[in-house]
């Protein structure tokens, strides 16, 4: 099948002891091979500070996955989610202020 680029969505969880969990979700993409990782100041975080979801079919012939990490509240602007899929790549910021999600469809 032809390439379907992912929809990328970044969300923040509730604050807990000064930390927040930021989750980057990639959905509705094909083929299934994808790179999704959190970066701090442009550098990828170590594997043991990130949690990945399995790449699973969504029932529509496309796939989805996610990656999450915990960060200090107030440092959101230092973190970005990096996505690479079928030769395309993109960087997605953590939403700032009261906004709790941000999404973008790659073309």
């Amino acid at each position: 099948g032809s390439t379907v680029p992912p929809m990328v969505n970044v969300t923040c969880s509730e604050v807990s002891e000064g930390n927040i969990t930021v989750t980057c979700r990639a959905s509705s993409f094909y083929p299934r091979n994808i790179t999704l990782t959190w970066r701090q100041d442009g550098v990828s975080l170590s594997h043991n500070t990130q949690q990945w979801g399995d790449v699973l079919p969504d029932g529509n012939g496309t796939y989805q996955t996610w990656v999450a990490t915990r960060i200090r509240q107030g440092e959101e602007q230092r973190f970005t989610c990096y996505m690479e899929h079928s030769g395309n790549h993109g960087t997605h910021p953590v939403p700032s202020g009261n906004s709790h999600h941000h999404h973008h469809h790659h073309h």
């Epitope: 989750t23 029932g59 529509n60 996610w66």
Partner: antibody, heavy 122, light 112 residues
Amino acid sequence: QGQMQQSGAELVKPGASVKLSCKTSGFTFSDNYISWLKQKPGQSLEWIAWIYAGTGGSSYNQKFRDKAQLTVDTSSRTAYMQLSSLTTEDSAIYYCARHDYYGTSGAWFAYWGRGTLVTVSA
Amino acid sequence: DVLMTQTPLSLPVSLGDQASISCRSSQHIVHSNENTYLEWYLQKPGQSPKLLIYKVSNRFSGVPDRFSGSGSGTDFTLKISRVEAEDLGVYYCFQGSHVPWTFGGGTKVEIK
């Protein structure tokens, strides 16, 4: 963990249809794969199908493709399974169960409803 | 379809004993995403099944550490190190790697 509340027992006639419901609360509905399973008395379990609540996409066991139809209503946080052209072979307990995709379990049936008994009898 | 074969069918135990249940799949059950979705469930009479083990060896939250899962390829095992009264019931293995997902026939753990 959240709740999965299934509809009550059904007594239906052969050839009829029935729509079972699984109403959820206490978790983000759209993040879940909801599966339906069948269990006849004293027997093992059979997986019927799953539906991903976030998109309505689904995957079926071919054996049940013409028997079961899965839908979700995100506004009421409810998953449904319609069973059609019922025969006595369809008499069983039907369970809904969920996989929390953005949770940590990585298991397909982490949380279960209590089941709905469907009896097909003339 | 992947056939899941459990042995034994019935397992009489004394409380405090170790119990071991075997599950063999008719083919390798590695998902295309490289995970092995081999799970174990316990069903007590009149209740819904409950998840014990997922991805071969991971205990689900709240499951006592006397339960352990192991295996690879086509051979998998559930062990209960010291059987307690609350462990009695029917155990099912399950594969969620290849559609249609399938269960084993069940192993009934009961008092000798």
